[in-house]
Structure formats: C-alpha cells, structure tokens
Interface confidence: low
C-alpha cells in the first residue's frame, strides 16, 4: 500500500514542473515576498501522510488553479473532507480572513479553480488545505510566480537552404502563441525555447530562449528525421509551460552521394586531389628555385649588405643601377661588371644579432690566442663550395693550424634570408685561372675623393657585435690583425661620391675613441670586391705600413647612446676630446678606427682606406674627425 502511495506521489510530483525550484531563478522569485516553493511530496522527508499542494498554475495571468494530493483518503484513516481556503494579502496586518475555494470542479479532481473574478495579479495569495478544521498544508504566492503558459500551437517548418555538399540543411521553424495568451495587448510577454533531436536520439538539443515565434535551425543532417518541440514561459517570471506537440522534420535526399558518415567519399577525393595538387606545386617550386636550394645546401660566403643600395637591385641582378650608384666618378668603369661573365650574385643571410654572442669569424681566423681550440668556426659560412674570393690567400698565410681550422664550415645551416640582406659577392667561376691573381681590372685610375666634412654618418645598427670589447694585439706579426675588422661595410655614399665604409663588427656599443695616437692603415687587395667580402689577409700584409711593436687596443665608448644611430664627424671630435673610460694607454697604443672612407682607388693594388676619426701625430690633420683632404693624403702617403 505504501509503495503504491509513493509511486502515485512521484507520478504527481513528476508531472508538475510549475514549482520546480531549478527552473525558476532566485532573481525572478525574489520579486515577491510570497514565494512558492518546489514541493515534491513523495521526496520530502516528511513523516506525515497528509494532503499536500502539488501545483498551482496560471496559464495566462488571468486565472489560476491549484492541485493537491489526496494520500490520506486512499489509506485507512479518514480525516474528513479536504477543503481549500485562500486569503488575499491586501492588508497591512496578519489578517485571518479566509475564504473557501470558489470552484472545486472546473480544474478536475483535487483542485481549485480561480476564475478572473477571483484572480488579482498584483496581490499575493495564501492558500491552505484543511481537514477536520486543522491546516494540513499551506502555500503563498503571487500569480506572476505561477504563470505557466499553455503550449505553443501550429508548429510548421520550411527549408531555408542546403549546403553545397548536400550534407546539411537549414530550416525555419514557426509556431503561434497559445490562444489564451494575450500577446497583442502585451498582458503577456512570452519567451520560447525550442528543442530538437534526431528521432532515434534520447537527448534533446536546446536552443537559446527567443521572443519571436520563429527560429532558424541550422546544420541538420539530410536524410535524417528530426523531432522539434517548443515551450514558452512568461518573460521574467513564472516557469516554462508544457511542450507543444512534436513536429517531425524529414529532410529529403538532395545529393547524388548517399553515404552514412557525412559523405566520406567526396571528402577523401578532395583530400587526394589536394595532396596531389600540393605535390605538383612543390615540384614546380623546387625546379624553379633550383639555384636557391643549391645555395641553401651549399651556403655562400657571408657578405655584409651595402647600405644605401636597394637590395632589390642586387636581388634582381640589375648591375647597371648598382654600378651607377657606386661609380659616381668618371674613373670608375661600369664595364667592370657588365663585361665579366663570371660575376655572380649570391643571396646571403646576415646573422641575427642574438646569434653573434661569439667572436666574429675574422677574429677567429686572425686570433693569436692559440688556447682557443674550436672544432669549427661555429658560424654560418657562406661558401658556396666553389673557390671563395679569398680562400687561397688565407690558406697561404702562416696561420697556426689551430687558428684556421677550415675555410668553410662542414655544417650547412639553413639561411634566414632577410629582405634587406641580399648581398653581392663577386666570386670567381673560372677555376682554371688563378683565383687570386690579377682579378682586379687594371683600368682604374687613381682618384682622390674629397668627402663632405660635416656629413652625418649612420652608425651601422644591424651589424653584429662582438662580445670581446677590447683586444690587445701585437702588430709585430703582420698577420695578427684580429682587431682590424675586415668586414668593411659600405654605410653611406656621400654627395661628393665617397663610399663611406664601416666595419661590420664592434660598432654597436659605441665608437672607438679618437683621442689616441693613430697610425694610418691602408688595406690593399688584389681581388678588389665592390662589396664587403673578406679583405684577403695576404694582400693586406703587402699594403699595411705598420710601426713595429705597436700595441693596438680597441676601446668602446660606453657614453655613447646605442640609440644614437647617426653620428656626425663633429660628434666624433667631441668623443675624441672626452677622456676615455678605459685606462689611458701610452702614445704607442692606438685604437682601431671604426669609420673608414675610401680616399684613393689604387690601380690594381686596391684601396687605400683612411681612419676618419683619428688625428695624425706628426702630420697636419683636421681638427675634426672628418675626411682627409688631398693635400693631407699626399703628406701621409708612404
């Protein structure tokens, strides 16, 4: 008997969702002090078997009805007739003005119906069940809290569109508000919730609540049958009403394919064709870029970029324009490039600044520190595999084997090709000719160029920096010129036509001091390269007049801001006048110049480079660290 009662109770409780606490948010319910509480009679830990309210509902905010269980009367104990009394809380006091239910019939068994005459939307109600004069249950609520609209009616659907693949379709579902809901006058504002699922599925998919009576449902599978249902609730209060009758949606077959799993075959076909197409494109790319790939595998000699020259000119091989820029003077022969068939352009990558935490490869090659034993240079070598510009010269020298290692790195690392790092190297193709002899044309006439004195010179900001900031080297051995940077970088071309070179190393942290006693250093090179290739050390030996046993020390001026990109010759003079931050070295010690300008192009011998920022001890010199005049040049020429 008790089990039967429990089942009945659960059935009644399950049929009602009007008072399900989970469905009504606290914010909504807190609008009125006379809140209703979700009561599941069979689930309550209540020892009494008295009648309980199960549901109070208003379908349209104009009438309402309340229902209760009648457990006791199905048992052995008879407590007498069940009566419902109600009171409207429209007074300030706790009044006891109870009236009996106006209609026990209209809403069915164990119910009380309140028509519009007995319904007031704004006034809270309290209701109680009595038996033999004793209260067995009581609830309070406002009508707004118990609004549960009737189900939406007249559901239908229309096809919106079908996907290109014919796999999915979109539909528009429409319905009408319940007949008794006064939507037009705004007495009720309903929000709707649509749910749908495949016929064979158990879980409904819910869509977000909407205020309109139609909604699109997207991406339904073609050839599947769907169930759609809609329910509504009074906006901002109450609970969802019952669901509408289920609408069945069957989407017709619209594709020539008939596959279960989202038409697997066409997708596979697309993938196959895609892979094939990509492979073809890859082959085309590989064949068209054969030279690039060859250079990636066999990297070329690293050459710094030429500042002031559009890298695109170099990349596209437009030598005429490069020559025009470089050869502003009559003395320069443009035929130099255009006539020689062996001139080749090689794209190089300039190492990233963060990769330059070690010595420059020049320093390694020329270092007299034999204790440093490197297995290889450890830097990206740009040797293309053919004879490098200066390789024989370097190998000719009396370098210690520990210092040289290999001219080219065995490790071919992939090159990061920067847009502005496409550099020019003039390599020798003809292996039969001497690769290092008489490569420079003998047609060039000596030409003295006077630079503008006050022309600002840009500091090379992208040049890599060496970690060692001061290197002490004995110049007694002419090959020990590790502090002289052989990356002479063209940093500017003055309006007067001088090509201003700057070293690619040791210039980021600041300028070398100008206040030491300098020695004029001229570098000669047989294989005259218009770009910043290696100055061959063997040729340098022929041309550099060096005072014996003069110790060279490179000083970094830390007071110069790294962000000061342009430094004028005046600023160099100022720097020269400043006391050095390093210890003061004797007159016999000299800093290596950071800025060098081309003053004479000596036929075939090469260039005479002059230190711009260094005053000359015994000769007449400019007060500012500018360019050396012709007269001064004649004086200082050996």
């Amino acid at each position: 008997m008790d089990l039967w009662q429990l089942l009945l109770t659960l059935a009644l409780a399950g049929s009602s969702d009007a008072f399900s606490g989970s469905e009504a948010t606290a914010a909504i319910l807190s609008r009125a002090p006379w809140s209703l509480q979700s009561v599941n009679p069979g689930l309550k830990t209540n020892s009494s078997k008295e009648p309980k309210f199960t549901k109070c509902r208003s379908p349209e905010r104009e009438t309402f009805s309340c229902h209760w269980t009648d457990e006791v009367h199905h048992g052995t104990k008879n407590l007498g007739p069940i009566q419902l009394f109600y009171t409207r809380r429209n007074t300030q006091e706790w009044t006891q003005e109870w009236k009996e239910c106006p209609d026990y019939v209209s809403a069915g068994e164990n119910s009380c119906y309140f028509n519009s005459s007995f319904t007031s939307i704004w006034i809270p109600y309290c209701i109680k069940l009595t038996s033999n004069g004793g209260t067995v249950d009581e609830k309070c609520f406002s009508v707004d809290e118990i609004v549960q609209p009737d189900p939406p009616i007249a559901l239908n659907w229309t096809l919106l569109n079908v996907s290109l693949t014919g796999i999915h379709a979109d539909i528009q579902v429409r319905w009408e508000a319940p007949r008794n809901a006064d939507i037009q006058k705004g007495w009720m504002v309903l929000e709707y919730e649509l749910q749908y699922k495949e016929v064979n599925e158990t879980k409904w998919k819910m869509m977000d609540p909407i205020l309109t009576t139609s909604v699109p449902v997207y991406s339904l599978k073609v050839d599947k049958e769907y169930e759609v249902r809609v329910r509504s609730k009074q906006r901002n209060s109450g609970n969802y009403g019952e669901f509408s009758e289920v609408l069945y949606v069957t989407l017709p077959q619209m594709s020539q394919f008939t596959c279960e799993e989202d038409f697997y075959f066409p997708w596979l076909l697309i993938i196959i064709f895609g892979i094939f197409g990509l492979t073809v494109m890859l082959f085309v790319f590989l064949f068209s870029k054969q030279q690039r790939i060859k250079m990636l595998i066999l990297p070329p000699v690293p050459v710094p970029k030429i500042k002031g020259i559009d890298p695109d000119l170099l990349k596209e091989g437009k030598l005429e324009e490069v020559n025009t820029i470089l050869a502003i003077h009559d003395s320069y022969k443009p035929e130099f490039h255009s006539d020689d068939s062996w001139v080749e352009f090689i794209e190089l990558d300039i190492d990233e600044p963060d990769e330059k935490t070690e010595e420059s490869d020049t320093d390694r090659l020329l270092s007299s520190d034999h204790e440093k034993s490197h297995s290889n240079l450890g830097v990206k070598d740009g040797d293309s595999g053919r004879t490098s510009c200066c390789e024989p010269d370097i190998l000719e020298t009396d370098f210690n084997a520990n210092d040289i290692h290999e001219g080219t790195s065995e490790v071919a690392q992939p090159q990061r090709l920067k847009g502005e790092a496409d550099l020019l190297c003039l390599d020798q193709k003809n292996q039969n000719n001497s690769p290092y002899h008489d490569a420079c044309p003998a047609t060039q006439q000596p030409s003295v160029i006077q630079a503008e004195k006050n022309k600002p010179q840009p500091l090379p900001t992208e040049g890599a920096e060496s970690t060692h900031q001061a290197a002490h080297i004995q110049l007694s051995n002419p090959s020990s010129l590790s502090n002289i940077d052989f990356y002479a970088q063209v940093s500017d071309i003055t309006p007067a036509g001088s090509v201003v070179l700057s070293p690619g190393q040791k210039n980021k942290a600041g300028m070398s001091q100008c206040d030491m006693h300098p020695e004029m250093v001229s570098l000669c090179q047989e294989n005259f390269l218009m770009d910043n290739a290696y100055f061959c050390e063997a040729d340098a030996k022929k041309c550099i007049p060096v005072a014996p046993h003069i110790k060279v020390e490179s000083h970094i001026q830390p007071s110069l801001n790294q962000e000061d990109i342009y430094i004028t010759t005046e600023s160099l003079t100022t720097a020269a006048g400043r006391p050095g931050t390093g210890e003061h070295v004797p007159g016999s010690e000299m800093p290596v110049p950071d800025y060098t300008s081309i003053h004479i192009v000596q036929s075939p011998q090469g260039l005479i480079l002059n230190a711009t920022a260094l005053p000359l001890p015994d000769k007449e010199f400019l007060s500012s660290c500018g360019y050396v005049s012709t007269d001064q040049l004649n004086k200082i020429m050996p």
């Epitope: 807190s30 002090p33 209703l36 509480q37 309550k44 704004w122 004793g134």
Partner: antibody, heavy 124, light 108 residues
Framework: EVQLVESGGGLVQPGGSLRLSCAAS????????IHWVRQAPGKGLEWVAS????????YYADSVKGRFTISADTSKNTAYLQMNSLRAEDTAVYYC?????????????????WGQGTLVTVSS | DIQMTQSPSSLSASVGDRVTITCRAS??????VAWYQQKPGKAPKLLIY???SLYSGVPSRFSGSRSGTDFTLTISSLQPEDFATYYC??????????FGQGTKVEIK
C-alpha cells in the same frame, strides 16, 4: 556576495528615538523581504518587523506595533528601523536578516543571511 | 500568535553523540519551520528550512523532520563545532514569526 551591515545602535534614554540602518549588498532589497530580529542579553531571538518593498507590505510584532516603523530606500539598497518611545525592554542586539527565497513552491520564510548586529541600550 | 515550545532548554553531549531537539507548535503551521544555530557573539545561521530541507553549505549530519505539529532537529554525530544554541522558528505566512526559546548544546 550577500552581505548585511547594521548601524545606528547606541545608548538612548527611555522614551527616546533611534534609527537603525541595514545596508545590503549582493542582492536587491527591492525584490527581497528584510526582517529585523532582536536578542536581549542572555535571552532568545525575537522577531520584530519585516518589509517587502516590492509590494510595500510591512509587518510588526505586537510588542513593537505603533512604536517602530520599518522602511526601505531601494535607491540606497538599505532598510531602516525607526524606533520611537523606546523602553528598557527594547535593549537588545538588533539583527537585520534577509528572507531566503527557496523558489518554486514550498513556501517558508526562513532567514538565510544575517548582519553582525548592532547593540541598542535603553537606559536612564 | 503561534507559540513555539522548544525542548530541552539545554543538554550536555559528547562528540559523536546523536542529538535531538524538539519544537512543538501551538497550532498547525504546515511545514513552515526553520532551524538556526547561534554561537556566542555571532548572528544565527540557517540550518533547515521548510521543516526538513537542508540549507546549502550545511553539513549533512543535520536533518529536520515533522510529525504533525512536532518538529525535530537531529544532529547524527555531534562535532566539536556543533556546540552552540539552536532555535526553531515558525515561518507560517499567515502568522507573525515566532522563535522557540532556544536549546543550548554543551560539552559533557
């Protein structure tokens, strides 16, 4: 986070007046029922008054009817208890509390959040 | 007004004991009864509402039940933090609120 903070308590002579404030945060006083409950030293809890701002209903215990007035300023989210004609027996810690809305159907005016209380001492 | 008679007024118990506190309403209040715990100098805390519903965050060792006009609060296994004073409250919508006089649970 729901919080209630009472203020305005103090020492007052018999026959005097005092206004207690209950500042609410974390919920809207407009849609809630605010109650005042007091506790005399060493005694039990005694319900004093309540207000349901949404409907404008106010309720009082018989012991304070006519002397105490409960009100609310919804713009300040604060409830007040104006106490006039105070007596010695009104000496107590006054708590404001919020009625717990269980939602749905089984109505019960339980008080879920309480303030820390403010002491009112009526003495000559 | 409905009177709530709470018993016992005090009791001594040990940790782990099962404790039962009873409240009797002077007339039918349906299930509109709540139980509170109060510690000295603190505000009351809601434990049970609607006679038998456990308030959120309250340990499950607390439970409430109703038999007619008798309402019971049970602590299944008393814990050290449970030593406090417990109040019942009738919250019938048709009557002014009334509290029981309280039951003080002390350590034996």
């Amino acid at each position: 986070e729901v919080q209630l903070v009472e203020s305005g308590g103090g020492l007052v002579q018999p026959g005097g007046s005092l206004r207690l404030s209950c500042a609410a945060s974390g919920f809207n006083v407009s849609y809630s029922s605010i109650h005042w409950v007091r506790q005399a030293p060493g005694k039990g809890l005694e319900w004093v008054a309540s207000i349901s701002s949404y409907y404008g209903y106010t309720y009082y215990a018989d012991s304070v009817k006519g002397r105490f007035t409960i009100s609310a300023d919804t713009s300040k989210n604060t409830a007040y208890l104006q106490m006039n004609s105070l007596r010695a027996e009104d000496t107590a810690v006054y708590y404001c509390a919020r009625r717990y809305w269980m939602g749905g159907y089984a109505y019960s005016m339980a008080l879920d959040y309480w303030g820390q209380g403010t002491l009112v001492t009526v003495s000559s | 007004d409905i009177q709530m008679t709470q018993s016992p007024s005090s009791l001594s118990a040990s940790v782990g004991d099962r404790v039962t506190i009873t409240c009797r309403a002077s007339q039918s209040v349906s299930s509109a009864v709540a139980w509170y715990q109060q510690k000295p100098g603190k505000a009351p805390k809601l434990l049970i509402y609607s006679a038998s519903s456990l308030y959120s965050g309250v340990p499950s060792r607390f439970s409430g039940s109703r038999s007619g006009t008798d309402f019971t609060l049970t602590i299944s296994s008393l814990q050290p933090e449970d030593f406090a004073t417990y109040y019942c409250q009738q919250s019938s919508s048709t009557q002014p609120f009334t509290f029981g006089q309280g039951t003080k649970v002390e350590i034996k």
